[in-house]
Interface confidence: low
């Protein structure tokens, strides 16, 4: 007499999220007279998965009918497949008795069930830094399978190269997460500049997943200040002007002080955007010099973004006041933050 | 037992700060990402905020970014919403809800039973 | 940010029906949406993520298909504790967004 054998023809079989799994399984006899079972992962604590007998399994189909004469037939159809349901099945004979005897087992189908990346999620550095300076951007996208995936960084389309990163768990899962970090250099002209994290994953079918942060939300660009005197008007007055060129963000306050006294605070808004996404403002103060007998020391005060206050100041020469059309004196530098002064 | 409790919830003048809590338990709280989502009276759910298990991002719907922030301290268990410059329509019924398993790949399975958020003056 | 549209407003059904709730985006979402209940003064419940997969605990009379931009739940056999309402909610792009939601009555 030929010996039963359980034919499970697929060691493997890959299904996408959502679809249905077919596992295949025949028997070469019908002898001796038992049941099949399916069951997931072996040893005492496997799982059954299936049982023509009784039991209810609503995801689970024959893919023939097991109740007609001579079916050798038990491959079955898994429906709804999410990644909880990856493991290799195994399709068992059982002798028929009290209770029924377990025969022989088939050699067992691994399911791995493929399931989509979610949409990369970028996060940038909790505070602003400024050019020169090197930002750490974090991308992360969980839920697939399997767990092979390609992630690249772009800057402005150019791939970055300064990157980490890790897919977890090590090990055996349903499903996995990948996060990675890449540092960037800021320059002056990054305030329109965009990193792209780019997600390519089996089940993606050659269209990769993107996601995006803006470099305006990471970097600060410090101002440029400058302060000139106009031309001397006929009523003794002297129009100061303090130019603030090149910042970002737009969040801006400038103060004058006459000879250390706080004359007039402004606030930025509203200002037109220079092509590199900076900005510039200028202020001015009209100092009316026959009001003075000693020269006027006027300083402009900007506090940037939260950051320590600059200062440049000027000095405007009440004794030569009649002559001094158009000067264009070169303004002192008092800043606190010298770093700041360009 | 998985439980979720809110709180901090009151009433606010246009314009002020409140601060909601959400202290988890019954489960391993850092391995969830976690989200707030309102209900206005005699309205529908609208999704606010998320943050992910480990806290580094965050997300926020267009009516309350820059005004709202979410955060979270894994070594307590608890989940906030930081609520600035409240409005009007700010208030409804704020639930805190975690993600099932996989950050925030699939849907809200677990739900606190809400906090009551009224801005009025 | 992607609308979900849900429909009917409300839906009047016996006990023992088939009622059938519909979802529509307003861009693909591919699987990823949740159908949720919530009946009177209680939070949400999750009944369906992936489009079609059954939570934890939800009994087998629901169920949810469809891809893309087009959603249905149904509920094969309504007893008395469906009666509530149900929103859809899709986790594709952020922001996340919910339907309108649909009120489930008795009729």
């Known amino acids: 007499e030929e010996e039963l054998q359980v034919i499970q023809p697929e060691k493997s079989v890959s299904v996408a999220a959502g679809d249905s799994a077919t596992l295949n399984c025949t028997v070469s006899s019908l002898i001796p007279v038992g049941p099949i079972q399916w069951f997931r992962g072996a040893g005492p604590g496997r799982e059954l998965i299936y049982n023509l007998k009784e039991g209810h399994f609503p995801r689970v189909t024959p893919v023939s009918d097991p109740t007609k004469r001579n079916n050798m037939d038990f491959s079955i159809r898994i429906s709804n497949i999410t990644p909880a349901d990856a493991g290799t099945y195994y399709c068992v004979k059982f002798r028929k008795g009290s209770p029924d005897v377990e025969l022989k087992s088939g050699a067992g189908t691994e399911l791995s069930v493929r399931a989509k990346p979610s949409a990369p999620v970028v996060s940038g550095p909790a505070v602003r830094a400024t050019a020169e300076h090197t930002v750490s951007f974090t991308c992360e996208s969980h839920g697939f399978s399997p767990r092979d995936i390609t992630l690249k960084w772009f800057k402005n389309g150019n791939e970055l190269s300064d990157v980490q990163t890790n897919v977890d768990p090590a090990g055996k899962s349903v499903s996995y997460s990948i996060r990675s970090t890449a540092r960037v250099v800021l320059t002056r002209r990054d305030v329109h500049s965009q990193v792209i994290c780019e997600v390519a994953h089996v089940t993606l079918q050659g269209d990769p997943l993107r996601g995006t942060a803006n470099l305006s939300e990471a970097i600060r660009v410090p101002p440029f200040l400058e302060v000139t005197q106009q031309s001397m008007r006929a009523d003794n007055q002297v129009n100061v002007t303090c130019q603030v060129t090149k910042f970002y963000p737009q969040r801006l306050q400038l103060t004058w002080l006459e000879n250390g006294n706080v004359s007039r605070t402004e606030m930025a808004s509203a200002l037109p955007e220079n092509k590199d996404g900076t900005y510039n403002w200028t202020s001015w103060l009209l100092v009316n010099v026959s009001a003075h007998r000693d020269d006027v020391k006027l300083t402009c005060q900007v506090e940037h973004d939260g950051q320590p206050a600059v200062n440049k100041s000027f000095s405007v020469k009440v004794s030569a006041h009649p002559k001094e059309q158009g000067s264009n004196t070169a303004a002192e530098n008092t800043g606190t933050n010298e770093r700041n002064i360009y | 037992e998985v439980q979720m409790l809110e709180s901090g919830g009151g009433l606010v003048q246009p314009g002020g700060s409140l601060r909601l809590s959400c202290a988890a338990s019954?489960?391993?709280?850092?391995?969830?990402?976690m989200s707030w989502v309102r209900q206005a009276p005699g309205k529908g759910l609208e999704w606010v905020s998320a943050?992910?298990?480990?806290?580094?991002?965050?997300h926020y719907a267009d009516s309350v970014k820059g005004r709202f922030t979410i955060s979270r301290d894994n070594s307590k268990n608890t989940l906030y919403l930081q609520m600035n410059s409240l409005r009007a329509e700010d208030t409804a019924v704020y639930y805190c809800?975690?993600?099932?398993?996989?950050?925030?790949?699939?849907?809200?399975?677990?739900w606190g039973q809400g906090t009551t958020v009224t801005v009025s003056s | 940010e992607i609308v979900m549209t849900q429909s009917p407003a409300t839906l009047s059904v016996s006990p023992g029906e088939r009622a059938t709730l519909s979802c529509r985006a307003s861009?693909?979402?591919?699987?990823?949406l949740a159908w949720y209940q919530q009946k009177s003064g209680q939070a949400p419940r999750l009944l369906i993520y992936?489009?079609?997969t059954r939570a934890t605990g939800i009994p087998a009379r629901f169920s949810g298909s469809g891809s893309g931009t087009e959603f249905t739940l149904t509920i094969s056999s309504l007893q008395s504790e469906d009666f509530a309402g149900y929103y859809c909610?899709?986790?594709?792009?952020?922001?996340?967004?919910f339907g309108q939601g649909t009120k489930l009555e008795i009729k």
């Open positions: 809800a975690a993600y099932s398993g996989s950050y925030y790949y699939y849907g809200m399975d677990v």
């Open positions: 019954g489960f391993t709280f850092s391995s969830y990402a």
């Open positions: 943050i992910s298990g480990s806290g580094s991002s965050t």
């Open positions: 861009q693909s979402v591919s699987r990823n």
């Open positions: 992936g489009a079609s």
């Open positions: 909610q899709q986790y594709n792009n952020w922001p996340y967004t």
